[in-house]
């Protein structure tokens, strides 16, 4: 992956580093869940950071069917009020009151899979979400925190002399900018927008002529990326033998 | 997609000069910086130095201060470096490259000999 | 000068094999660099980009990472017309300097 400015050469490197990002489902499969059982259902809340635009699916606990009375999901998005969708086995009806997402849904009929999906996240899918299965031993929760991850754009450019400027553009939750090698660099800007992103700005210059070309790093929970680009020579300078 | 052609081989005697040449297409020449690199005969590569066509700044590696010289054409697309005094141990294959070292030349060889 | 230390300068390894070179730079400077491969006759091939980048038409075995300050180039399983010397190259700093090479032979 290449890109390329007017004034300069700006090369891109996305690295292969991708985290707990692979897999958009928690749910384990009928093996694991009796290995596991106990533990499980201990895992009360789980916090999970999830790609946005990709799919998620959300479990509840491992209760056998034969067991349910009643399966609730309870979904509480930042600034909307509660929605719940509630399946009762014995009736099989199925309610919803208050959800208005058309991306969230069941997997399939709630009497064949309780899990709960959203097809695709988005950025307003932040919030938590919780299963509750009332059987007549009591009531089993699963609770999930659910990150949005937004990618930052990243870009790199030379805005004055020997001074570069990085910026990850509209990244959830903020992306760490570093650079190679390190330069004089001024105090890192972060710009948040409405939607919950941030924009994170570093500015840095490089006094020593001997430094030829500079990287950007950008670290963040959905990858990281690296631009580079070599400085343009000081105006006036004609000729360098070795400066350093 | 960025080319630079450099012809296959240069012949010439000891103590004289040659100048190299290396024709650029794909890409905004005057911006990007066009780099040279020595290779002799199943050995490593060295680093001689560069231009910014856009301006004629250079910097040499201070092995090559006195032997290479760096420049450009912009009309003709080309930057050119000249060899002097030449000695076998002169006798290499020569690389321009350029977009921070991802696009080069297929080398010109040079031959030193009487 | 920022020194290129390359290891190993010589390997032999059998077809399917996974292979692993490294550069460091001198004193531990951090820099970025790319990976080549050259063939006998031939110019420099581009396989690695800026330390990870994978350049297009190369095969998906070759990868590169940078640990710290060092820096990996992996063949997963080598192949035949794997055989070549390979060399890293440090852009960060003025001179540009390379790794000594690493000749990759086939067992």
């Known amino acids: 992956e290449g890109a390329a400015q007017s004034n300069n050469s700006l090369m891109l490197q996305t690295s292969k580093e991708n985290h707990t990002l692979a897999s958009n489902s928690l749910c384990m499969d009928e093996k694991q869940i009796t290995q596991n059982h106990s533990k499980v259902l201990a895992e009360v809340n789980i916090s999970w950071p999830v790609q946005m635009a990709r799919n998620a699916v959300l479990c509840c606990p491992p209760i056998e069917f034969r067991n349910l009375i009643v399966i609730t999901w309870e979904i509480i998005l930042r600034g909307q009020p509660s929605c719940t969708k509630s399946y009762r086995k014995e009736t099989n009806e199925t309610k919803e009151t208050n959800c208005t997402d058309e991306r969230i849904t069941w997997v399939s009929t709630p009497d064949q899979n309780s899990d709960l999906q959203i097809h695709p996240v988005a950025i307003t899918h932040d919030g938590y979400y919780r299963c509750i299965m009332a059987t007549p031993d009591g009531n089993f929760h699963r609770g999930y925190h659910l990150q949005v991850l937004v990618t930052p754009e990243v870009t790199l450019f030379e805005s004055r002399n020997r001074t570069a400027v990085c910026k990850a553009v509209a990244g959830k939750p903020a992306a760490q900018i570093s650079w190679i090698p390190a330069g004089d660099c001024a105090p890192t800007e972060q710009e948040y927008w409405g939607n919950g992103t941030v924009t994170v700005k570093s500015t840095c210059h490089w006094e020593g002529h001997n430094v030829s070309t500079v990287t950007c790093h950008v670290s963040h929970l959905t990858g990281n990326k690296s631009l580079y680009i070599e400085l343009l020579p000081v105006p006036g300078a004609k000729k360098s033998a070795k400066l350093y | 997609q960025v080319q630079l052609q450099q012809p296959g081989s240069e012949l010439v005697r000891p103590g004289a000069s040659v100048k190299l040449s290396c024709k650029a297409s794909?890409?905004?020449?005057?911006?990007?910086?066009m780099h040279w690199v020595k290779q002799r005969p199943g050995q490593g590569l060295e680093w001689i130095g560069n231009?910014?066509?856009?301006?004629?700044?250079?910097n040499y590696d201070e092995k090559f201060k006195s032997k290479a010289k760096l420049t450009v054409d912009t009309s003709s697309r080309t930057a050119y470096m000249q060899l002097s005094s030449l000695t076998s141990e002169d006798s290499a294959v020569y690389y321009c490259?350029?977009?921070?070292?991802?696009?080069w030349g297929q080398g010109t060889l040079v031959t030193v000999s009487a | 000068d920022v020194q290129m230390i390359q290891s190993p300068s010589s390997l032999s390894a059998s077809l399917g094999d996974i292979v692993t070179m490294t550069c460091q730079a001198s004193q531990g400077t951090p820099i970025n660099l790319h990976w080549f491969q050259q063939k006998p006759g031939k110019a420099p091939k581009l396989l690695i980009s800026?330390?990870?980048n994978l350049e297009d038409g190369v095969p998906s075995r070759f990868s590169g990472s940078r640990y710290g300050t060092a820096f990996t180039l992996t063949i997963s399983s080598l192949e035949d017309e794997d055989m070549a010397t390979y060399f890293c190259?440090?852009?960060?700093?003025?001179?540009?300097?390379f790794g000594g090479g690493t000749k990759l032979e086939i067992k």
């Open positions: 231009i910014y066509p856009g301006s004629g700044s250079i």
């Open positions: 490259l350029t977009m921070t070292g991802t696009s």
């Open positions: 800026g330390a990870s």
């Open positions: 794909g890409h905004t020449f005057t911006s990007y910086w």
């Open positions: 190259l440090q852009f960060t700093y003025i001179p540009w300097t």
